[in-house]
């Protein structure tokens, strides 16, 4: 077992709070598995405190994860039958040993509570519980002390109860009536119907029978049924008030006196000192962590727990480390948030499990109307006007590349850019020089090209401009529509995803 800071919870902290030496104790408390809030303070099945606790002195740099813990086992004896389902409370207490006014100071460091289902005689069950920043690793098991046997520690009952299917004088002391101990060898001749024995060669009588071999009905003795034979020649004595008066056994249990006290023989489905506890049903909520209980409509039928994601065990009591299954692909970071699993993907990957490779056009399309271009084992986005970046998600400054020629001034516009040309130039990018004599504009081409046929050149330029203008107008319409849709979709998705992850991590 171990007790210390949980993983990923920062620097291991000392349990002593830097106030000198301290000791850790564990208090283990067992309650019936169906205990109500009203009996919350009662450890009805038993409680125990750990012993032989070593002193822990904090040393600089020493990891609190290696705390010296109480040696050996914490044994919790239970008097009655083992109920099978129980509540386990483990408290970790710190005793500060330094000089304090009023003696040692005690503080409760951590308290874990959980319902468990466990048969006696089984192997050690391992568990990990986290509370606050502390983590407690422990194992537990239930064992019967002889002569008790079986999963419920059925034992020979020391009571004069009616015979049961277990045989004369034997009855189960648990809600498991099929588990019985072999009967003792009684005095020869002891009535198998009306007598029983707890020790070899004895014969004890069930109620209503008497005699050395329990063969004489009480009604044939000198007293009536309701009276007890007194000393010789004194007639009959009325019985005084006994432990069974008023029948302390609930739920139809039958009471029998045992050495000044009483015992209850409980009907099937009930157990406890006074038969006050019923067998566990789905209505008792035996499944932890919101698990769905199926079956178990009555105490005699078994129930099964269907666990929520992230939990396992017969009662959904064990948290699953789902990240150990490495669900995040391509080196993504796994975050098990309890109620959900999240993958934080490396650059170049996306998807719930980082399964989409963004360096592959099949993985995800370019945003904002960009087109994906593959080549050389990688991909790039050819972005629409006004957008840039790896996936065309970034709004680009269209004027950054100084697209306006001949000193033209560039203005960014919702659909791209506009050039305000310097005097003597015109065109979308100010690429045409205007002749001072009022002749047609021609491109400001290199000197050697300016002597070419101006008419033919100009017709070509006009055709190009018309095509470009049509393309730009069509592009603007498509771009505005698709950009609005895509921006809304991706921004909403990203903001929501980041907010959700932040919220869940905080939760």
């Amino acid at each position: 077992h171990s007790f210390g800071p949980g993983p990923g919870l920062g620097t291991p902290r000392s349990p002593c709070n830097a106030r000198g030496p301290c000791r850790l104790f564990f208090r283990v408390c067992l309650k019936p598995g169906v205990s109500q809030e009203a009996t919350e303070s009662l450890c009805a099945l038993g409680a125990a405190l750990s012993t032989s606790v070593p002193v822990y002195t904090e040393h600089p740099g020493e990891s609190a994860a290696a705390l010296p813990l109480p040696d050996g086992l914490v044994r919790v004896p239970f008097r009655d039958a083992w109920p099978g389902t129980f509540s386990l409370v483990i408290e970790t207490w710190r005793e500060q040993l330094g000089e304090h006014a009023g003696g040692p100071a005690w503080n409760l460091l951590a308290r874990v509570v959980g319902r468990r289902r466990l048969a006696a005689g089984g192997p050690w069950a391992r568990d990990v519980q986290r509370t606050g920043t502390w983590e407690l690793h422990f194992s537990y098991r239930a064992r019967c002390e002889p002569p008790a046997v079986g999963a419920a520690c059925a034992r020979l009952c020391r009571s004069r109860s009616a015979p049961s299917r277990c045989g004369p004088g034997l009855r189960p002391c648990t809600p498991f009536p099929d588990e019985c101990e072999a009967p003792s060898v009684c005095r020869p001749g002891c009535s198998p119907e009306h007598g029983y024995c707890e020790e070899p060669d004895e014969c004890r009588c069930l109620e209503g029978w008497t005699g050395p071999l329990c063969t004489v009905p009480v009604s044939t003795s000198s007293c009536l049924n309701s009276r007890v034979p007194g000393p010789a020649s004194t007639g009959c004595l009325l019985p005084g008030p006994g432990p069974c008066d008023g029948n302390p056994c609930a739920n139809g249990g039958s009471c029998s006196e045992t050495s000044g006290s009483f015992e209850c023989a409980c009907p099937r489905g009930f157990y406890g000192l006074r038969c006050e506890v019923s067998g566990v049903t789905c209505a008792d909520g035996p499944c932890f962590n919101g698990g769905l209980c199926v079956g178990g409509e009555d105490p005699d039928s078994a129930y099964v727990c269907h666990c929520p994601p992230g939990f396992q065990g017969s009662n959904c009591e064990k948290r699953v480390d789902r990240c150990s299954l490495q669900p995040c692909q391509n080196g993504g970071l796994c975050l098990d948030l309890g109620h959900a699993l999240r993958c934080r993907c490396r650059a170049g990957f996306a998807g719930p499990r980082c399964e989409h490779d963004l360096d592959d056009c099949a993985g995800r399309a370019c945003a904002n109307g960009g087109t994906c271009v593959e080549g050389g084992g990688s991909r790039r986005c050819s972005c629409a006007l006004g957008f840039g970046g790896r996936d065309c998600r970034e709004r680009a400054d269209p004027c950054a590349s100084r697209p306006c020629a001949h000193g033209g001034r560039c203005y960014a516009h919702f659909s791209g850019l506009v050039c305000a040309c310097a005097p003597g130039y015109m065109g979308v990018r100010c690429e045409f020089a205007v002749r001072p004599d009022g002749a047609d504009a021609v491109p400001a081409a290199p000197r050697g090209l300016r002597q070419a046929d101006p008419q033919r050149f100009l017709a070509g330029v006009i055709a190009v401009i018309v095509v470009v203008v049509i393309a730009i107008v069509a592009g603007i319409v498509v771009l505005v529509i698709s950009r609005k849709k895509r921006m809304a979709k991706y921004e909403k998705a990203e903001i929501k995803e980041m907010g959700e992850m932040h919220r869940e991590l905080n939760a």
Partner: antibody, heavy 117, light 107 residues
Amino acid sequence: EVQLVESGGGLVKPGGSLRLSCAASGITFSNFWMNWVRQAPGKGLEWVGQIRLKSDDYATHYAESVKGRFTISREDSKNTVYLQMNSLKTEDTAVYYCTTGYYFDYWGQGTTVTVSS
Amino acid sequence: NIQMTQSPSSLSASVGDRVTITCKASENVGTYVSWYQQKPGKSPKLLIYGASNRYTGVPSRFSGSGSGTDFTLTISSLQPEDFATYYCGQFYSFPSTFGGGTKVEIK
């Protein structure tokens, strides 16, 4: 027999408040997570919120649509869970059900909340 | 949140018919899907959990199947008491979300 009985519904103006109760019987109430689920008229089911157990420090979770306006609490000694609804909007008009567990196995009969001016 | 898309939104069938309702999740939800039945003016009732397991007391004519993103509720032989609205719900990721419902009406 397991029974969940909701109460406290009614007509309220936008911006107003209402407190719903759900009383449980036939179950060991303190062992069950409790949820509120609502159903707008003619619509489907929408999870509203959840409260867990004392051992979970009575942790609560809420749907985005009600976060900051609705509060769930429970009183295990009375086998009752509550839904405090503040700053009510017309879109909160619905039948409100209380349910148990993670998988909503037991349901109450529902109580109607109408938010209208 | 995970979206659950149910189809059809309504259907007409006769007693004895085999009825199939489908539910599609917007992402993988494993087998963490439940089906609920709701009659007019009543609260929903759990029918199927874990995609294919019948809940306590649910008749054997109801069955569920599927995993991942595609799920089906089948009523092998429709009975008069089965005319109701059916909802699927996913419980893989918090918060739980439901489909829009399928109303099964008498033809």
